[in-house]
């Protein structure tokens, strides 16, 4: 049973219609209204990801027997990263806890490939999703989530790590992308913009949404995050776009109401456990999937991204609270904490539903260039 929330059936970009149609071009602003990021110059010439940070740079996943009993992931794979080139960022470098990725920030020096060579890899995230070009894969079954409805106790740690707000999740949250593709949730965090400026990481036909939630998971084939980094399918992220709706989202309010307590970079608080699945869209059957990377250093590849077709609705006040409460380093607001979209470089985005079939009058012949390659493997 989920906490009540807005727009359970709103499609991507579909406003508050409540209809569950796949996203159509007519729902999106024109390209002039929301310019797409340019690809980072010379990216193809940069070194690959052979030199991933060693395991000493990465936090371990604590076993349940250790104090707090929660998976520790505070400073790594938080799947975050730098904004549009035309929107220079003023904020957010890492917590000062001594790992090799501790000095990156959004929209400025040092260049990320210098922080972690993997950031120059060919299969990076986030990406622009073009539903018309997505490969429909009937083998992509509805996601399965187990144990996501957490009781109020034990409490969870909510932290401002200087580049996002992150909720550390306890053991026991299991997620399956399909048979034999099982994961456990580690943490969730958000990406957002600023007043009047959207801040999702992924885009759809160039359209950027107000915000985006990421729930980061570790494959059950691995005991620790550092073992999984860079391994195909080692990590999986569930991503959902957050949009403005007419009512307050009570699930998100349980987190947003606590942001003032962690306004300062590096601060943290404890929040009662909540229904984590209530932070996600209700339709687990319609999504896009592709293989990419963490969206912040170390930018490790092999991450399976699942981006929901349905959006989650928050009130205007809630979106404002998200983008206007937290502070990053150097007395700067923590805003616009998203990375520019990265080139697909031949990757095919798969869809669990026929996203390329558009009912719009403007789309007489759906373009379905790609075929499903390996869904469900």
């Amino acid at each position: 049973q989920r906490l009540p929330r807005m727009q359970e059936d709103s499609p991507l970009g579909g406003g508050s219609s409540g209809e569950d149609d796949p996203l159509g071009e007519e729902d999106l602003p024109s390209e002039e209204d929301s310019p797409r990021e340019e690809d980072p110059p010379g990216e193809e010439d940069l070194p690959g990801e052979e030199d991933l940070p060693g395991e000493e740079d990465l936090p371990e996943v604590k076993p349940k027997s250790e104090e707090e009993g929660s998976l520790k992931l505070e400073d790594l794979p938080t799947v975050e990263a730098p904004g549009d080139p035309q929107e220079p960022q003023n904020n957010a470098h890492r917590d000062k806890e001594g790992d090799d990725q501790s000095h990156w920030r959004y929209g400025g020096d040092p260049p990320w490939p210098r922080v972690s060579p993997a950031c120059a890899g060919r299969f990076q995230s986030p990406v622009d999703i073009r539903p018309q070009l997505a490969a429909f894969c009937p083998a992509l079954r509805p996601l399965e989530l187990l144990g996501f409805q957490l009781p109020p106790l034990p409490e969870l740690r909510l932290r401002n790590n200087g580049h996002s707000v992150q909720l550390t999740l306890p053991p026991g949250l299991e997620m399956a992308l399909g048979p034999g593709r099982e994961y456990r949730a580690l943490q969730l965090h958000l990406h957002w913009g600023a007043a009047g400026r959207p801040g999702s990481e992924h885009t759809v036909e160039g359209h950027r949404f107000p915000a985006e939630i990421h729930v980061v998971h570790l494959s059950t084939a691995f005991a620790r995050v550092d073992e999984a980094l860079g391994r195909p399918g080692g990590l999986a992220v569930l991503a959902a776009f957050l949009e403005e709706g007419p009512e307050e989202n009570s699930a998100y309010e349980q987190l947003l109401s606590r942001l003032e307590e962690i306004a300062e970079e590096g601060s943290e608080t404890q929040v009662p456990g909540l229904d984590i699945s209530a932070l996600l869209p209700s339709d687990f059957s319609r999504y896009f999937q592709y293989e990419g990377s963490l969206t912040t250093p170390p930018c490790a590849q092999g991450v399976i991204w699942t981006v929901f077709n349905q959006t989650v609705m928050l009130s205007a006040k809630q979106l404002h609270t998200l983008s206007d409460t937290l502070w990053g380093p150097g007395d700067s607001r923590l805003q616009l904490n998203f990375r520019a979209t990265q080139p697909l470089n031949g990757r095919v985005i798969e869809a669990s539903f026929p996203a390329g079939v558009d009912s719009s009058p403007r789309a007489a012949e759906p373009v379905q260039l790609n075929s499903c390659l390996a869904a469900g493997d």
Partner: antibody, heavy 124, light 107 residues
Framework: EVQLVESGGGLVQPGGSLRLSCAAS????????MHWVRQAPGKGLEWVAF??????????QYSASVKGRFTISRDDSKNSLYLQMNSLKIEDTAVYYC???????????????WGQGTTVTVSS | DIQMTQSPSSLSASVGDRVTITCHVS??????LSWYQQKPGKAPKLLIY???NLHTGVPSRFSGSGSGTDFTFTISSLQPEDIATYYC?????????FGQGTKLEIK
């Protein structure tokens, strides 16, 4: 026998201060989150504040009506809970109960042990 | 804050009657609801936790049910010593909130 005994209530003028104490016995005090709940004359129950246990860093939480004026604290060595009340208002007049909350082995916020209460009267 | 609405605010019943009190919550709280009994001049006592679990030492005539936003508290056979005010309380998130109370009297 599990027991909570409050003390420190009394009559105080608006703007004044008072410190309530609660002595706990019969259970492992250090394991538990501890709360203050109050009840204005003829009214219902209102949660005021709680303080977490040692394992959770002793961090406090307050209701909006008392935040910035009241401070909850504890001394595990004395099995004692405290509520320092400053800038008291007439609407703070109530019976204040010391209450035991959850612990590491529970998964739910409920109040299973209550003290007998101590009366705080704020009046000019 | 989560709002709790109890009904009725007062009720009168006879010994042996089945008595039911309801608690409506402003948002989904799963099963994180407790019921308390408070007799005049005394501290409240926990009766039911997690919507339906009977606290240690509480007579079996007391029961609770419900989940989400609507909860019910029942006394299967009212006894004279049950005269009290009953409160529901949510434990989903803080600030923890109580219902306004239901005063139970004997006819």
């Amino acid at each position: 026998e599990v027991q909570l005994v409050e003390s420190g209530g009394g009559l105080v003028q608006p703007g004044g201060s008072l410190r309530l104490s609660c002595a706990a016995s019969g259970f492992t005090f250090t394991d538990y989150y501890m709360h203050w709940v109050r009840q204005a004359p003829g009214k219902g129950l209102e949660w005021v504040a709680f303080i977490r246990n040692k394992a959770s860093g002793y961090t406090p939480q307050y209701s909006a009506s008392v935040k910035g004026r009241f401070t909850i604290s504890r001394d595990d060595s004395k099995n004692s809970l405290y509520l320092q009340m400053n800038s008291l208002k007439i609407e703070d007049t109530a019976v204040y109960y010391c209450v035991r909350g959850g612990h590491a082995g529970s998964n739910y916020w409920y109040f299973d042990v209550w003290g007998q209460g101590t009366t705080v009267t704020v009046s000019s | 804050d989560i709002q709790m609405t109890q009904s009725p605010s007062s009720l009168s019943a006879s010994v042996g009657d089945r008595v039911t009190i309801t608690c409506h919550v402003s948002q989904n709280i799963n099963v994180w609801l407790s019921w308390y009994q408070q007799k005049p001049g005394k501290a409240p006592k926990l009766l039911i936790y997690q919507a339906s679990n009977l606290h240690t030492g509480v007579p079996s005539r007391f029961s609770g049910s419900g989940s989400g936003t609507d909860f019910t508290f029942t006394i299967s056979s009212l006894q004279p010593e049950d005269i009290a005010t009953y409160y529901c309380q949510q434990g989903q998130s803080y600030p923890f909130t109580f219902g306004q109370g239901t005063k139970l009297e004997i006819k």
